[in-house]
Every structure is written in structure tokens, then in C-alpha cells.
């Protein structure tokens, strides 16, 4: 049997509930040796690739996907996969992004604390952080429709 690739994890900075027009960065993490990270929205067919991979720790690499100004169309579930030659990994669990209207209230927090979804976490019922199953994501200029992985 082939050697299994560890599942990637996904997190969002500064969190998973983002005010309209603010920025969010998805962070995908995997093992060292990753050539390409892919951020998928909902399914295989809508994604963005990057080869801008950095080493997060001696055993982990990461890539960051930033949306400068989120719109309502960016809301939904996202997941990561990676390519470590010669194979694509499984997908991470989904991370659900919520986009909220800015209320302007001084007591209302702008974001939820940084949230993540990874292989060791159980699926969550939390409506803005679906750790174990789900998907949807970035705007046209950020995430593109494709028919195949590569």
C-alpha cells in the first residue's frame, strides 16, 4: 500500500466571522516537501493554487491565501489540499467563513478568534466553523473554476 499523506489543516486569520470589506487570510498547513497548496471553495471545481510555500516548523509547511476585501459572495465553506510529488493529498476538513454587515456597535467584536479545522478535530456544529464536513468560497478574482486538478 502507498504511504498515506497526512491530511492538511486550514485556519483563518483573524477569524471565521469577518466584517464586510475587511480582509481575511486562509492558512493551509501540511508536511514538509509540499510543492503546491490549493484552497478549494465547496468542491474540486473552484480553487486557487500557490507554490509560495513556507516552512512553519521543522515538520510543517504552510501557504497563505488572502482576500483583501471580503464580500457576501466570499461566505461559505473552504478546504485545503496539497501536492507533494507525486501525489495530491486528501482534503482538509471544511472551514466555514461568515461575512457580517458592520453594525458599528462599539461592543460588538469584529471577528471570532482564529479558527481552524484539521485532521485531529471532531466535526463541529458551530455554524461558523464546520470542522468536519462542508465547503464554498472566494470571489472570482481570487478563486477560479477548473475542470481538473492539474
Amino acid at each position: 500500500q502507498e504511504e498515506d499523506l497526512p491530511r492538511p489543516s486550514i485556519s483563518a486569520e483573524p477569524g471565521t466571522v469577518i466584517p464586510l470589506g475587511s480582509h481575511v487570510t486562509f492558512v493551509c498547513r501540511g508536511p514538509v516537501g509540499v510543492q503546491t497548496f490549493r484552497l478549494e471553495r465547496e468542491s474540486r471545481s473552484t480553487y486557487n493554487d500557490t507554490e509560495d510555500v513556507s516552512q512553519a516548523s521543522p515538520s510543517e509547511s504552510e501557504a497563505r491565501f488572502r482576500i483583501d476585501s471580503v464580500s457576501e459572495g466570499n461566505a461559505g465553506p473552504y478546504r485545503c489540499i496539497y501536492y507533494k510529488p507525486p501525489k495530491w493529498s486528501e482534503q482538509s476538513d471544511y472551514l466555514e467563513l461568515l461575512v457580517k454587515e458592520t453594525s458599528g456597535g462599539p461592543d460588538s467584536p469584529d471577528t471570532e478568534p482564529g479558527s481552524s479545522a484539521g485532521p485531529t478535530q471532531r466535526p463541529s456544529d458551530n455554524s461558523h466553523n464546520e470542522h468536519a464536513p462542508a465547503s464554498q468560497g472566494l470571489k472570482a478574482e481570487h478563486l477560479y473554476h477548473h475542470h481538473h486538478h492539474h
Epitope: E42, P77, R79, K87, S89, Y94, D125, A132, P133
Partner: antibody, heavy 120, light 111 residues
């Protein structure tokens, strides 16, 4: 895009049998969950397990571990090896692939099934 | 191990009526829930994925919803062609828990 099962047969209790699922029109390298599901006559669907066609990760139903083995044998074929078969394993065995365009891994593509009969 | 309890096991309803089928998960599975329709001698057909999203080509008379760990398939304005067995399935595959399980099925008869 399609998947098709083969290898169904009439075999005696205690025997072993290997079923094959042949894929066409898509690439295993893209990383699909290829799953095996069975259905005894007049009964419901029963999940056996899945293999991720690129990474090689395999997941089994707890009852299937040990007697059932899922493997990727080529770039277009996945197999299900079954051992120590009993009459309770008599069923139509389906191969299914998760979706290309939908999230949350639903089985979108199903084969027609292959019948396995265990009888002396 | 994950268990999906599907109710009712069978239901009979008249043409034009509405049927509700429930699937209760023994643990949290988020939106990893699909619904299938199967007619005798045929392979299953995907109806709903991600708990509430309609698969392409499926009539909008089929609707999926979720409340916590309870999932519901509602079929409105029933037609004779809806007579079939319906199954829910957890579509999460991973080490967190054993997914993949199907509910026991609901046989729908159209009167």
C-alpha cells in the same frame, strides 16, 4: 465519466473473491474517494469502505476490517478483496465515486453493481 | 461508531402530498450528509449533498435541511415517479470517526 464493477460470481462459503471497479473518463491522480457499498437482496445499502485514489488513504466500516481489503491496483482500477465469505455476504456490490463538482464528498457516480452469491 | 437512524422505515402518501423523512446522527457530522433515491434494480441516485444542497437535475420538490444532528428530507407535491427507497449517508471519510454509514432506508409508496 463512469465506473463499472466486475468479478461477481457464485462461490462456496469460506471462499475468497476479488471484485474490480474500472474507472473511465477521469483520472485517479486527481484524488477521488472510490467507495464500495453493498446491498443484500431486499435490504438497504451498506457502506464497506473507501480509498482516496491519490493519497492512498483507506477507510473501512468497522465490521469490514480484516475480511475486506480495498486496494488501488492501477491508474484506472480499484479492487475489493473478500475472504471467509458466508451467506450473509450475498449481495450486489456497488462501486461509487465522490463528486467532482459538489462539496462534502457525496457519491455522485455509481456503477451498475455486480452480484455476489455465496452458496454451497 | 457513527450510527444513522432513519425514520420512518416506510411511508405511504397520495399524489400531490408531502412526505418528511428524518435521519438522526449519533454524533456531530456537520454538513457531511447526503440523500439518495433508489428504485428496484437500479443504482442509487444522488439527490441532496452537504445536508441541504440540491444535486444538478433534481427537482426542487426535494429539499434537505439540518438541525444539529437531525437531518430531514422533504418531498413536496408527490408524483408517482417518486415511489422509491430513500437513504441518508454520512459522507465524511477520515480518522476522526468512522463515516460512510447509511441510514436504514425509507420506502415511499405513492397511493
Amino acid at each position: 465519466q463512469s465506473v463499472k464493477e466486475s468479478g461477481g460470481d457464485l462461490v462456496k462459503p469460506g471462499a475468497s473473491l476479488t471484485l474490480a471497479c474500472t474507472a473511465s473518463g477521469f483520472s485517479f491522480s486527481d484524488g477521488y474517494y472510490m467507495c464500495w457499498v453493498r446491498q443484500a437482496p431486499g435490504k438497504g445499502l451498506e457502506w464497506i469502505g473507501c480509498i482516496h485514489s491519490s493519497s492512498g488513504s483507506i477507510y473501512y466500516a468497522s465490521w469490514a476490517k480484516g475480511r475486506f481489503t480495498i486496494s488501488k491496483t492501477s491508474s484506472t482500477m480499484v479492487t475489493l478483496q473478500m475472504s471467509s465469505l458466508t451467506a450473509a455476504d450475498t449481495a450486489t456490490y456497488f462501486c461509487a465515486r465522490d463528486s467532482e463538482s459538489y462539496g462534502y464528498n457525496p457519491c455522485e457516480l455509481w456503477g451498475p453493481g455486480t452480484l455476489v452469491t455465496i452458496s454451497s | 461508531e457513527l450510527d444513522l437512524t432513519q425514520t420512518p422505515a416506510s411511508v405511504s402518501e397520495a399524489v400531490g402530498g408531502t412526505v418528511t423523512i428524518k435521519c438522526q446522527a449519533s454524533q456531530t457530522i456537520s454538513n457531511y450528509l447526503a440523500w439518495y433515491q433508489q428504485k428496484p434494480g437500479q443504482r442509487p441516485k444522488l439527490l441532496i449533498y452537504a445536508a441541504s444542497s440540491l444535486a444538478s437535475g433534481v427537482s426542487s420538490r426535494f429539499r434537505g435541511s439540518r438541525s444539529g444532528t437531525e437531518y430531514t428530507l422533504t418531498i413536496t407535491d408527490l408524483e408517482c415517479d417518486d415511489a422509491a427507497t430513500y437513504y441518508c449517508q454520512c459522507t465524511y471519510y477520515g480518522t476522526t470517526y468512522v463515516g460512510g454509514a447509511f441510514g436504514g432506508g425509507t420506502e415511499l409508496e405513492i397511493k
